[in-house]
Structures are given as C-alpha cells and as structure tokens.
Interface confidence: low
C-alpha cells in the first residue's frame, strides 16, 4: 500500500489585504481515518487555524465539502486577510485516536499579504517662515506590505529632490510605515503653491496615493510700506497715505504715530488680493496743515502676523502757500479733529 502523502503544491501565496486566500492541500489516501488540521507555524507554539473535525473558525472554510465520499482535497479559504495573517501554513494529517496522533505534515505554504498603504498625510511646519527660508514638510503612510515602496515629492507639479525617507521597521514585519521629510525653499510667489507627497506601491496597481499641503499655511510674506502725502481740495488739509503691499497672511495691525506718539490704531479690514495670493491695504490720515508745528513726522507702523513691527516715516511737507492760508490764531493738533481721524481704503 502506497504511503500517505500530504501535498501542499504552492511554496508561497501572495494575497491583497481584505481579499481571501486559498491554501491548497490534498492527501493521496483517505486511509488511515482521521482529521486534517491546518496550523500557522511549526513546533510547540504553532497556531491552530482550522480543524476539520470540530471548532468554530469563522474566517476559515474548506474549498470542497470534506464530508463527500472520496474527497481528498482539504484546501481552505481564509477570508478577509489582514497583514497579521502572514506566515507559513501547514496542512497536517492526523490518525484518529485518543488523542489524535499526528501522522504527516505538508511542506508548508508561506502566505504573504499585500496591504495598501494608508492615504499619505502631509504636515507642514508649526510656524510660518518668510521667503528665501527653508521649511520642512513631513509625509507619513502606514500599514503597507510588502516593504518595497516609492515616495516622491512635488511642488506645483515639479519633482523635488531634497528629501529624506525612512521605511520602518528595518526587519521583517507584517506591515510597514514610511516617513519622509522634504525641504522646500519658499519664494514670495508661494502663497498659492502646494506640495504633494506621492506614494506608489504594488497594491495600488499604478494609481499612486497622494497627500497634499498648501504652502499658504507655512509662508509669511512681510509687507512693504510706502508713505506719501497728497493735497486735498481744502487748502489747509493734506492726505497722508500708508500703502501696505504684498503681505500674507491677512492679519495686520497698523498704528499711526505723530512725532513718535500714537495717534490711532487700525486693524486691516477691506483688503485687495493680488494674483499671487498676497494682499494690499492702505490707511490714510487727513492732516490739518494750519495746526502744524515745524518738523512734524508721521510714522506708519505695521505689525504683521504677530511679528515685530516695521515702520515707515514721512516728514510732513507744508508749502509756503499753505502757510499763508492759515490765520495767525490757528492752533491745535496736526491731525484733523473730525472723527475718525484717519480712513482706510
């Protein structure tokens, strides 16, 4: 009589997480009578996966009906595979007894699990930086298998080269994680820019996953200031304007000083947006030239996004003609006394 053989035809099987795996096993004889069991791993610590005779194995089913006469196929389906199911599976024939006696084992089938990486999450710097500075963006994706993975960075569609990537763990594992840090040099035009982290993996079938971050969250474009005066129709008044240009983000506090003394403070409200995403704003004062003292300096001081204030000063220019229009009795503050003292637009 030919000796019973337990045949596991595949040395290895690869399955995508969430799918079912089929592990094939046939025996060459139904004699002697006794159950077939499936284990993961070998030796005393092996894990019982399926017992034909008894037990409840909700994810494991036999491919063919093991109770059918002359059925020698003891292949199993394992449903809803996860990376934790990876390992070597053995089909083992037992001789019926009390207890059942192990008779013969198959050579084993290694189950490797292909698991999709999670959607990449891109995080930017905690504090904003100004143009010409370098900021770091981090991209993370988890839970993939096998370990081989490709990660690329793009800024506005252009591939970046300054980045470092690590895949963990270094050794064998059921699943892996990737972390990559890219360094991006900011420019004044980056308010509308975007960085993209792209992850390609065998499970994604050529359709990579992408994570994005907007540079608008990372950039601060400081304003440029310009102060100038214009005459008004009333001959004893001039308009002094502070033009605040090309700043981002919007948060801005403007203070007017007269010879170093605070005269009024405004928060930027009605802004105009530039094509590059930066903003412009202007604030103006009506100045009574008849109330001047010689050498009045008006200063426009701007605190942008909580940064140290920047300022621009302007010495009030009063023409001889304007001086002539003023009566000798005129006195009082330089700024027009009507409220509000200034205006913006």
């Amino acid at each position: 009589e030919e000796e019973l053989q337990v045949i596991q035809p595949e040395k290895s099987v690869s399955v995508t997480a969430g799918e079912s795996a089929t592990l094939n096993c046939t025996v060459t004889s139904l004699i002697p009578v006794g159950p077939i069991q499936w284990f993961r791993g070998a030796g005393p610590g092996r894990e019982l996966i399926y017992n034909l005779k008894e037990g409840h194995f909700p994810r494991v089913t036999t491919v063919l009906d093991p109770t059918k006469r002359n059925n020698m196929d003891f292949s199993i389906h394992i449903s809803n595979i996860t990376p934790a199911d990876a390992g070597t599976y053995y089909c083992v024939k037992f001789r019926k007894g009390s207890p059942d006696v192990e008779l013969k084992s198959g050579a084993g089938t290694e189950l490797s699990v292909r698991a999709k990486p999670s959607a990449p999450v891109v995080s930017g710097p905690t504090a904003r930086a100004t143009p010409e500075h370098t900021v770091s963006f981090t991209c993370e994706s988890h839970g993939f298998s096998p370990r081989d993975i490709t990660l690329k960075w793009f800024k506005n569609g252009n591939e970046l080269s300054d980045f470092q990537t690590n895949v963990d763990p270094a050794g064998k594992s059921v699943s892996y994680s990737i972390r990559s840090t890219a360094r991006v040099v900011l420019t004044r035009r980056d308010v509308h820019s975007q960085v993209i982290c792209e992850v390609a993996h065998v499970t994604l079938q050529g359709d990579p996953l992408r994570g994005t971050a907007n540079l608008s969250e990372a950039i601060r474009v400081p304003p440029t200031l310009e102060v100038f005066q214009r005459p008004m129709r009333a001959e004893n008044q001039v308009n002094v304007t502070c033009q605040v240009r090309k700043f981002y983000p919007q948060r801005l506090l403007l203070t007017w000083l007269e010879n170093g003394n605070v005269s009024q403070t405004e928060t930027a409200s009605t802004l105009t947006e530039n094509k590059d995403g930066t903003y412009n704003w202007r604030s103006w004062l009506l100045v009574n030239t008849c109330a001047h003292r010689d050498g009045v300096v008006l200063t426009c001081q701007v605190e942008h996004d909580g940064q140290p204030a920047v300022s621009k000063s302007h010495a009030l220019e009063v023409s001889a003609h304007q001086k002539e229009q003023c009566s000798d009795t005129t006195s009082g503050p330089v700024l027009a006394p009507t409220a509000p003292l200034g205006g913006s637009g």
């Epitope: 089913t61 036999t62 491919v63 063919l64 009906d65 093991p66 109770t67 059918k68 006469r69 199993i76 389906h77």
Partner: antibody, heavy 118, light 107 residues
Framework: EVQLVESGGGLVQPGGSLRLSCAAS????????MHWVRQATGKGLEWVSA???????YYTGSVKGRFTISRENAKNSLYLQMNSLRASDTAVYYC????????????WGQGTMVTVSS | DIQMTQSPSSLSASVGDRVTITCRAS??????LAWFQQKPGKAPKSLIY???SLHSGVPSKFSGSGSGTDFTLTISSLQPEDFATYYC?????????FGQGTKLEIK
C-alpha cells in the same frame, strides 16, 4: 450581481424528454457544486441532482438512469437532461448553487415549471 | 437516506412573537444543516448554513442552533414579512434531504 436563470420547462407527455438550462452570471459556475431541486405544487422541496467541481455527479434514487446533469463551462451554464418523464416529475425545477466550501445552498434561481401530462 | 423531520408542521403566531421550529435528523449529520424560507410563488431563500451561520443579508432576528441530530430555528420577533414556510435540509451526504416544511401563519 450573482444570478441563476432557469429555462426549458414546459408541457411534455409521459415518456417524453426535456432539457432544462440554467444560465449563471456574476460567478464562475465550474468553481461551485451545482444542484437541481424540485417542488411539486403544494408540496415540499426535493433535491434531485448535483454536479461537483471535479465533474462528479449525484442523483436522487427516483431519477437515477433517467436524468443527466451536466455543465458547459464556456457558456457558464448548467443543464438537466430529463428522459422517460413521468407524471410524478411534474414540478417547478430550481437551479441552486452550493457554497464554495461546504456545499450549503446559497443562491437559488427563480425556477422553471415542468408539466408531464397526456 | 437520511430522513429529516420538522415540527410542528404548521404554526400560528402573532407579530412580535418569538417562535422556534425544530428539525430532527435520522442519523448524526454533524452540523451540516441548512434552513430556508419560502413564500408562495417564490423561490426558497437561504437563511442559515452549518446549523447556526447566517447567510449574508439575513437579519439577526433569525438564529439557528444544534449539532448531531437535533436542530432549531428561532425567529426572535416576528414581523409580517416572516410569515412563510420554513424548510430544514441536511447536506452531509447524498442524497441531500429536506424536512417536510413548517408553515408559519398569522394568528
């Protein structure tokens, strides 16, 4: 969508023949054990025949030698050739899919009526 | 052949009731027992396999138990759509055999 659609039923005289067909869609028929089950009007269910994935065939005693179950993989179809028909074969015939692992019935067709009468 | 006997043959119950149908096999069939529901003029619908496992899409108000020769189907809270005929079936060996059916009617 997984579906079974039977056809080929009708009125036939005793001793006559009829061939029932079952068209499968949404799955590969050859990967499953397939069955025919019948039900006479007002009566219970009766298993008639089965074909295994290896082509092995099984029949209930009353139809052995008269009925033949077969399948055509290219057409993803199951057949029941019924010869020497008797009045007692009058019933609605259902095509049924056996579960992939333990042959538990999971998918049923809508049935086709076979009437054997003179 | 393995004989399958269902009891009762018919049963009257009200909406909201909990009902139990039993099925006995003439010999040990392990847990290779299925339950089906059939409404007039319709094909049977698979409810339970291997004595206690619910087919996909079957509401959890249906439950099955048993092993060997004695099995039960329980419907925890009857709804109008549950009034139908129920069949048990053994599929441990050919020829597969069905119980004679239990007709569940509205009281």
């Amino acid at each position: 969508e997984v579906q079974l659609v039977e056809s080929g039923g009708g009125l036939v005289q005793p001793g006559g023949s009829l061939r029932l067909s079952c068209a499968a869609s949404g799955f590969t028929l050859s990967s499953y054990d397939m069955h025919w089950v019948r039900q006479a009007t007002g009566k219970g269910l009766e298993w008639v025949s089965a074909i295994g994935t290896a082509g092995d065939t099984y029949y209930t005693g009353s139809v052995k030698g008269r009925f033949t179950i077969s399948r055509e993989n290219a057409k993803n179809s199951l057949y029941l050739q019924m010869n020497s028909l008797r009045a007692s074969d009058t019933a609605v015939y259902y095509c049924v899919r056996g579960g992939v692992w333990d042959d538990a019935f999971d998918i049923w067709g809508q049935g086709t009526m076979v009437t054997v009468s003179s | 052949d393995i004989q399958m006997t269902q009891s009762p043959s018919s049963l009257s119950a009200s909406v909201g009731d909990r009902v139990t149908i039993t099925c006995r096999a003439s010999q040990d069939i392990n847990n290779y027992l299925a339950w089906f529901q059939q409404k007039p003029g319709k094909a049977p619908k698979s409810l339970i396999y291997t004595a206690s496992s619910l087919h996909s899409g079957v509401p959890s108000k249906f439950s099955g138990s048993g092993s060997g020769t004695d099995f039960t189907l329980t419907i925890s809270s009857l709804q109008p759509e549950d009034f139908a005929t129920y069949y048990c079936q053994q599929y441990v060996s050919y020829p597969y055999t069905f119980g004679q059916g239990t007709k569940l009617e509205i009281k």
